[in-house]
Interface confidence: medium
Amino acid sequence: LEIGRFDPERGRGAAPCQAVEIPMCRGIGYNLTRMPNLLGHTSQGEAAAELAEFAPLVQYGCHSHLRFFLCSLYAPMCTDQVSTPIPACRPMCEQARLRCAPIMEQFNFGWPDSLDCARLPTRNDPHALCMEAPENA
């Protein structure tokens, strides 16, 4: 995992790390997450219910890192050294959108604004942490 830098102003009053319990997000390179996640879900159960909507897309295999990307938002990596959830970096989002949005559109689903790539940190953004996908994800 390659991680950018951290903006300390965004890290007040964080909840403790918890084990990843969402089936889709197990075995992707990290084991701990934190709620609320980057989409505002307050529990893993709530996140898992929404994440399930993407299961057919993950199974379709439109992008090799789609599962990792989705999990970085719905069950973001947590470490005791950093008090904010850590999302994927923007390039991974853009690659996933490029490959998967056309598939979604075939079924009358748009790429949701909650997954808006422009809202994610770039790899070298000095004000936010973000993750690159591991080679084996």
Partner: antibody, heavy 127, light 107 residues
Framework: QVQLVQSGAEVKKPGASVKVSCKAS????????MHWVRQAPGQGLEWMGW????????KFAPKFQGRVTMTRDTSTSTVYMELSSLRSEDTAVYYC????????????????????WGQGTTVTVSS | EIVLTQSPATLSVSPGERATLSCRAS??????LAWYQQKPGQAPRLLIY???TRATGIPARFSGSGSGTEFTLTISSLQSEDFAVYYC?????????FGPGTKVDIK
Amino acid sequence: QVQLVQSGAEVKKPGASVKVSCKASGYTFTNNFMHWVRQAPGQGLEWMGWINPNSGDTKFAPKFQGRVTMTRDTSTSTVYMELSSLRSEDTAVYYCAREANYDILTGYIRPDAFDIWGQGTTVTVSS
Amino acid sequence: EIVLTQSPATLSVSPGERATLSCRASQSLRSKLAWYQQKPGQAPRLLIYGASTRATGIPARFSGSGSGTEFTLTISSLQSEDFAVYYCQQYANSPWTFGPGTKVDIK
């Protein structure tokens, strides 16, 4: 206190461009997206787009794509909206609006409502 | 583009009465809906976000409800300062869109 102060009224001729400024104060400028919304006389509200003051990234409504530019100056905590190729239908009050950041932990990723608005800038396009 | 429809277009209410405003979306917003109040010559003011959460400083007489495609703003007992135009807005998908507004005037 948190506030957004916009530049003064403008009168422009068709085909010209207008640049409206919005100066933020009372909060960390780079922590919240800034949006622009316009309102034609007697009409409703129309979203134009947003800028991420942290990175400079922008996103526009398809209707304005290619005609609108949004920029920011972090040294003065000011965002700018420039609209080109003006026509009479662009006569409106233009508002900047701060996107709320109700949970600093989830921040930018999740879209949110507009909690602070500028006072508005009247742009009149007339020949 | 998500289309928001507000009803009624105009609502005539007496002070002290209850006002119920409706906003319908052309597709599901989950709870990504806000309500704004606008008075003549003023900028809009955020009342409700997340469909049901009151913004800071908003009186308890304002309440929001609903999810998915059907949303309601209720003003439990109208005060003189509540007569204004009310807009709903969705921020689930770009382009973010507003409803056409409901004007609440004095009966």
